[in-house]
């Protein structure tokens, strides 16, 4: 509340994160021209990336283009961008959809398409959609462990959001346990009225607000966090401003002389802490 | 404007950039002792790396040292390093300039130079200039969409700097169009008044400032982003506060049942996305 | 000092930090089954990652889990996990503590003992304690430079902690050189009464605090920085709540056509650069 | 006591080949360059080619392209294939190696010598 008497100056935070869980990714996958199902286990290892402590990264789904090299080949026939002869095709043209640059002739795609050749990682991406369901939509069930130092230097006050008497095998519930800082990543969505099951295709940002309004004044102190969730990103977002959340990232390696890379478009869910408030003292 | 009679609470923000483009790269490679010319294609899992929302990196230069293993060998000789016997050298020491410890031996460098032998990755890095002109130089052409979400929470007021009615095909102008939210890299260097073919050879950090005046009483309500930007690093800084923007890193694989490492110092303009602003309402 | 008549404005601040320094790690390696004394260097590229401007991460120390390959084995026998028939083993259970989702059978984990078996990266992890001492616990002696660039819009001031005056071979001294901005880790401990060996045991957060008390009045002009130092995590923190600062990375690679990795879990301290401050004018 | 054990010595006509080894054996802690030198008759020890412990090699002009130097480092051992023999390349051919016996305690050593005769 407003005590217009007291001295107020805004929180200095610092966040650390812990998430927590196993996913079991069931995908088909290709080797040597045959089809057959995978099965793999991703742990923190494998589906979160070490971030900074106000945000952190939890992949929820991904396309991999595996065994790329640096050579030509014909671009993707994403729409428009087929060809019939050379004359459509631009020496030297970066197309910022396409991605290499332009050779100036056009080839066959496959059977029945031609696009112009590239310079380029190949054979190029696919712009397939993001599989549905998501790979790793089990991830709904992992929990993250937020840590919280404040500091309000003018009062030379520092507190935390865990304390020494809480349990480390809680769960965040806004009636129940509104004090643990351990939430279940599907309950935060939940919170925050939203469906995790079907952000995890395309990825999302999350916020996770943490508020101090901080009374200091020894006679009436009070300072403890609160808890809420709100949905970051635009889901009513126009194609052309790339929906959701997605990175691409490469694991490269040498074969037969030669450097190759695998390339990983990962979707999925960064979390965003958001820490504020006030410290007041008369 | 400052309205007295306004409560006026600061902005929390969160920030979602997403690069495009794609770099032509040519450069001399030796291999097996003979030098050719290398011409490869950089698209972004090559030069940016996943960063946290209110900072994005861009390699925009390189020097590579490809497969040094941890060994014995002479330090690079850098001015004040060469040695004549074992005297100079000093077994255990670990210079700072240096990359590895001392052994206690003085031994050729090269046919006419003899410098103190290190257990370090080896050889060690050459100190070698920065390829100029910067070998992703064109990355002036590339463009970031950059998504900003604020929220008042003491007016319980959220918006984003992206509207539905905006044309993803759009590029920021000043004049034109100030309120687009796709940015030309070159623009934002022209715009605060630098050359990017210059900053691309050492790197550099940009700002891009973000300020939110918002009026959100509702018979006056404003509440757009103005956008700004300046360089942040120090353009005439002294050599040995380290001038532009560059860091190492490592990749690691094994051969002949060594572990190998290719070190790469990545130059490349660090963009920060600063928001700041404050919503008043009566 | 409070000027009542000024006008304040809270600081905008963008960080750049560059760590110098190598360290020797000497460690018992097993290789075909023979134990060895293991000896290498670890320079910036091998400690350190490239993160965002206001923190910075250094490796202090780790515990590798080489060569594991997704397939089937018993888990680590941790407190409770033993098992004596299948009965105690759930199909499809996916136990948190655990890195992987049980088959339902119970199976020897060594000649004493026996635990469920789970589908995962194998061989599992062990929990054992992190190395004591601290693996790279000369990082003690690295040095990190901070630069920080500050600007107050409102009143059209902008200025940075480096000076054209100051001398790149100095080191901070809260007395001697308060104002030089390169610190040696083992000093920041110090100046927070905190103890460098013990915290690079487990890894911890470290606060560099960054103070701006600006009068912008051309009459009085005063705008330099004040350097303190915090620890945030919390040292004496429950087991539950994972006390310490470690994070888990995975290096992955290709043998006999099997994808293989390698596991990293990373201790080491985290720094935060909190700036904060205001400018205040007539 | 460490030691670096040369084989393949011999005799061989004009255009044969050989393929000289040499182990390092005994207590240590790494073996880093290793290398093959030669004396002839009558001549000063020369370098015929080295090799890093990252496999980072270097030859003679006068064998560059006919001799090739690689390492098993499993094994601790540095091999030559000399291909393409001519009489003079007929010496002793010796091994060395620079081996650390602790960390950061280096020491040169050189093996016995075999010896390459190249005559019709």
């Known amino acids: 509340s407003d005590k217009l008497y007291q001295r107020k100056e805004p929180v200095i935070s610092s966040v650390h994160t812990k998430v927590k869980g196993i996913a079991e990714v069931t995908e088909n996958v290709t080797e040597g021209g045959v089809t057959k199902l995978g099965h793999s286990i991703f742990d923190t290892a494998d589906y979160t990336f070490p971030l900074q402590g106000n945000s952190f990264f939890v992949m929820t789904n991904y396309v991999k283009s595996e065994g790329q090299v640096q050579t030509l080949c014909p671009e993707y026939p994403r729409r428009g961008a087929q060809c019939s002869s050379d004359r459509r095709c631009k020496k030297g043209w970066m197309d910022p959809q396409s991605k290499g640059i332009q050779t100036g002739r056009c080839v066959p795609y496959d059977k029945t398409r031609k696009t112009c050749e590239v310079s380029a990682w190949c054979p190029t991406e696919e712009e397939k959609e993001a599989p549905r369901p998501a790979l790793l939509r089990s991830a709904e069930n992992f929990t993250v462990l937020i840590k919280n130092n404040i500091h309000f230097p003018g009062h030379n006050y520092t507190t935390r959001n865990i304390l020494p008497t809480m349990n480390g095998s809680c769960t965040f519930h806004k009636t129940w346990d509104p004090q643990c800082s351990i939430f279940r990543l599907g309950d935060i969505f939940q919170e925050a009225g939203e469906n995790f099951t079907e952000v995890a295709v395309q990825g999302g940002i999350m916020g996770i607000e943490i508020y101090w309004d901080c009374n200091l004044d020894s006679w009436s102190h009070h300072c403890r966090p609160r808890y809420s969730f709100r949905r970051l990103d635009d889901k009513n977002m126009d194609e052309s401003f790339v929906p959701g959340y997605n990175f691409r990232y490469a694991k490269y390696y040498k074969e037969n002389n030669v450097e190759k890379r695998t390339l990983i478009k990962a979707f999925g869910i960064r979390f965003d802490i958001l820490v504020f408030g006030t410290g007041g003292k008369f | 404007s400052d309205k007295l009679y306004q409560r006026k609470e600061p902005v929390i923000s969160s920030v979602h950039t997403k690069v495009k483009g794609i770099a032509e790269v040519t450069e001399n490679v030796t291999e097996g002792g003979v030098t050719k010319l290398g011409h490869s294609i950089f698209d972004t899992a090559d030069y940016t790396f996943p960063l946290q929302g209110n900072s994005f990196f861009v390699m925009t230069n390189y020097v590579k040292s490809e497969g040094q293993v941890q060994t014995l060998c002479p330090e690079y000789p850098r001015r004040g390093a060469q040695c004549s016997s074992d005297r100079r050298c000093k077994k255990g020491w670990m210079d700072p300039q240096s990359k590895g410890i001392q052994t206690g031996r003085c031994v050729p460098y090269d046919k006419t130079r003899k410098t103190c032998e290190v257990s370090a990755w080896c050889p060690t890095e050459e100190e070698k200039e920065a390829p100029r002109p910067a070998l992703l130089r064109s990355a002036e052409n590339f463009t970031v969409l950059i998504k900003n979400n604020i929220h008042f929470p003491g007016h319980n007021y959220t918006t984003r700097n992206i509207l539905p009615t905006m044309n993803g095909s759009c590029t920021f102008h000043k004049t034109w169009d100030p309120q687009c939210s796709i940015f030309r890299l070159g623009d934002i260097f022209q715009e605060a008044g630098e050359n990017f073919t210059e900053v691309a050879v050492q790197g550099g950090i940009m700002g891009i400032e973000i300020y939110w005046d918002c009026n959100l009483d509702s018979w006056s309500h404003h509440c757009r982003p103005r956008y700004s930007f300046r360089r942040l690093d120090d353009k005439n800084m002294d050599e040995s506060f380290v001038p532009g923007y560059n860091f190492r890193y490592a990749k690691y694989y094994k051969e002949n049942n060594v572990e190998k490492r290719t070190l790469i110092k990545a130059f490349g303009i660090r963009f920060d996305i600063l928001v700041f602003g404050t919503g008043g309402k009566f | 000092s409070d000027k009542l008549y000024q006008r304040k404005e809270p600081v905008i601040s963008s960080v750049h930090t560059k760590v110098k320094g190598i360290a020797e790690v000497t460690e018992n390696v097993t290789e075909g089954g023979v134990t060895k004394l293991g000896h290498s260097i670890f320079d910036t590229a091998d400690y350190t990652f490239p993160l965002q401007g206001n923190s910075f991460f250094v490796m202090t120390n780790y515990v590798k889990s080489e060569g594991q390959v997704q397939t089937l084995c018993p888990e680590y026998p941790r407190r409770g996990a033993q098992c004596s028939s299948d009965r105690r083993c759930k199909k499809g259970w996916m136990d948190p503590q655990s890195k992987g989702i049980q088959t339902g059978r119970c199976v020897p984990y060594d000649k004493t003992r026996k635990t469920c078996e789970v589908s995962a990266w194998c061989p599992t992890e062990e929990e054992k304690e992190a190395p004591r001492p601290a693996l790279l616990r000369s990082a003690e002696n690295f040095t990190v430079l901070i630069k920080n660039n500050i600007h107050f819009p409102g009143h059209n001031y902008t200025t940075r902690n480096i000076l054209p005056t100051m001398n790149g071979s100095c080191t901070f001294h809260k007395t001697w050189d308060p104002q030089c901005s390169i610190f040696r880790l083992g000093d920041i401990f110090q100046e927070a009464g905190e103890n460098f060996t013990e915290v690079a045991v487990q890894g911890g957060i470290m606060g560099i605090e960054i103070y701006w008390d600006c009068n912008l009045d051309s009459w009085s002009h005063h705008c330099r920085p004040r350097y303190s130092f915090r620890r945030l995590d919390d040292k004496n923190m429950d087991e539950s709540f994972v006390p310490g600062y470690n994070f888990r990375y995975a290096k992955y690679y290709k043998e006999n056509n099997v994808e293989k990795r390698t596991l990293i879990k990373a201790f080491g301290i985290r720094f935060d650069i909190l700036v904060f401050g205001t400018g205040g004018k007539f | 006591e460490v030691q670096l054990v040369e084989s393949g010595g011999g005799l061989v006509k004009p255009g044969g080949s050989l393929r000289l080894s040499c182990a390092a054996s005994?207590?240590?802690?790494?073996?880093?360059?290793m290398a093959w030198y030669r004396q002839g008759p009558g001549k000063q020890r020369e370098l015929v080619a080295d090799?890093?412990?990252?496999?980072?090699?270097n030859y003679a002009d006068s064998v560059n392209g006919r001799f090739t130097i690689s390492r098993d480092n499993v094994r601790n051992t540095v091999y030559l294939q000399m291909n393409g023999l001519k009489p003079e390349d007929t010496a002793v051919y010796y091994c060395?190696?620079?081996?650390?016996?602790?960390?950061?305690?280096?020491?040169?050593?050189w093996g016995q010598g075999t010896q390459v005769t190249v005559s019709s």
């Open positions: 060395y190696a620079t081996i650390e016996l602790g960390v950061l305690e280096p020491r040169d050593y």
């Open positions: 005994g207590s240590f802690f790494r073996v880093n360059n």
């Open positions: 090799i890093t412990r990252g496999d980072r090699t």
